[in-house]
């Protein structure tokens, strides 16, 4: 960021998405800004209207092509800066060399479905959308079962050190609704942080057999 | 090597309108800003507005909101400044200027020779 | 809108020797991207502005090293470390942080 009042936080999908929040103290109210992307070594530049999301902060994604498309690598660098309009001009606001692979937060994992669910446990899978090919096994995922009279944030969190796009869930209540999401992270890249969490999956386990212990 | 160069000096009535062009050349003009600055005679510089020749964008000092206008011809680079509802305090030299389009370091880096505009009855 | 007042209004000064000018604005003008667009330029006997100091204390292209510009917030220098006669003319502080950008009243700088 060009200050100390400003913080401008992007970070790269690893496909063809940067996504950028600015957000600074007494910003500029009804002024039109835009984050501009120039890498070092591509014939193409992007720009995105930042549009708010609170009274001091501001968001936009930098499409950068079609959304499995490698538009990044590693030796990489993008000068990224927040444009603000004054009069007829445009004033940067911030500005930082981004290393995309560095900033990595990836898509949430998607199509999240129920395998094969029994009383006491369920088996779920899931897929990682938008992840480069670069990664190849070199990804770690966090799970999280939401239980009733519950909250997301009380669920212990599973943690799965590898590539692994499937979970088997145990010691479940039966004839029992929960609720269900994953998150992935890249192992690359020093300010690389989790993708956001899936949607949730509901689910039911299957009663227990009448008669019988449970 | 960037050049501005000015239409010749002009005089006027009390209520009439004056137009000043600024020649653009050495650069590409729909890359730049043009602003306008005047200087009264004996007087310091008051910046007027500017304009975007790439797009026809303007902005005008709110001192002379509703008696300026800024317009450009980017078929022959020139960009113009009218002046409406003269009156005398405008009598003064009125140049134009080039400005990068994104503000990061100065506001004008080259200016024109500058316009005599006189307003007597 | 932000004034701003230079002083003196006029600064006679012997050629070799060092001149200083004061340029004072009316509020802060640390814009809030944390830049100070604070601008100086030199109107020659005659002729149109020139940019000497851009950003407080940055040369213009071309600007010899004897310029030099200085100050934070509301508090603005020129110096011209030894006086040449191609220095004559007005001198003239500018603030482009805060829209209308607007000019000092300019100081006189002439030989004695």
């Known amino acids: 960021a060009v200050n100390g009042t400003s913080q401008f936080t992007c970070f790269y999908n690893s496909r063809a998405n940067i996504s950028c929040v600015w957000s600074q103290d007494g910003a500029l109210q009804d002024t039109s800004c835009q984050v501009h992307a120039w890498p070092d070594r591509r014939r193409w530049n992007q720009t995105c209207e930042l549009l708010p999301v609170s009274q001091a902060s501001w968001a936009c994604n930098l499409i950068l092509g079609a959304p499995d498309s490698q538009k990044l690598t590693t030796v990489d660098i993008v000068t990224l800066r927040v444009l603000c309009r004054e009069g007829v001009r445009w004033r940067v606001m911030a500005i930082q060399d981004f290393k995309p692979f560095e900033n990595l937060r990836l898509m949430a994992p998607i199509s999240l479905q129920v395998v094969h669910v029994e009383t006491h446990r369920c088996n779920i899978s899931w897929e990682i959308s938008q992840a480069s090919h670069y990664f190849e096994r070199h990804l770690e995922f966090e799970a999280r079962t939401l239980s009733p009279g519950h909250t997301w944030e009380e669920a212990p969190l599973l943690t799965l050190k590898q590539k692994q796009e499937w979970i088997c869930l145990e010691t479940l209540t039966p004839d029992t609704q929960y609720e269900f999401q994953v998150r992935v992270k890249p192992l690359q890249g020093e300010f690389t942080t989790w993708s956001p969490w899936s949607q949730p999956l509901a689910f039911r386990t299957k009663p227990a057999a009448l008669g019988k212990d449970t | 090597e960037v050049q501005l160069v000015q239409s010749g000096a002009e005089v006027k009535k009390p209520g009439a309108s004056v137009k000043v062009s600024c020649k653009a050349s050495?650069?590409?003009?729909?890359?730049?800003?043009i602003s306008w600055v005047r200087q009264a005679t004996g007087q310091g510089l008051e910046w007027m507005g500017e304009i975007y020749p790439g797009d026809g964008n303007t902005y005008y000092n709110e001192m002379f909101k509703g008696r300026v206008t800024m317009t450009r011809d980017t078929s022959i680079s020139t960009a113009y400044m009218e002046l409406s509802s003269l009156r005398s305090e405008d009598t003064a030299v009125y140049y134009c200027?080039?400005?990068?389009?994104?503000?990061?370091?100065?506001?004008?880096?080259?200016w024109g020779q500058g316009t005599t505009v006189t307003v007597s009855s | 809108d932000v004034v701003m007042t230079q002083s003196p209004l006029s600064l006679p000064v012997t050629l070799g020797q060092p001149a200083s000018i004061s340029c004072r604005s009316s509020?802060?003008?640390?814009?809030?991207?944390?830049?100070?667009?604070l601008e100086w330029y030199l109107q020659r006997p005659g002729q149109s502005p020139r940019l000497l100091i851009y950003?407080?204390?940055n040369r213009f292209s071309g600007v010899p090293d004897r310029f030099s510009g200085s100050g934070s917030g509301t508090d603005f220098t020129l110096k011209i470390s030894r006086v040449e006669a191609e220095d004559v003319g007005v001198y003239y502080c500018?603030?482009?942080?805060?829209?209308?950008?607007?000019f000092g009243g300019g100081t006189k700088v002439e030989i004695k």
């Open positions: 509020q802060n003008i640390v814009h809030s991207n944390g830049n100070t667009y």
């Open positions: 200027a080039r400005g990068s389009y994104t503000y990061d370091n100065y506001a004008m880096d080259f």
């Open positions: 500018f603030q482009g942080s805060h829209i209308p950008w607007t």
């Open positions: 950003k407080v204390s």
């Open positions: 050495g650069y590409t003009f729909t890359d730049y800003v």
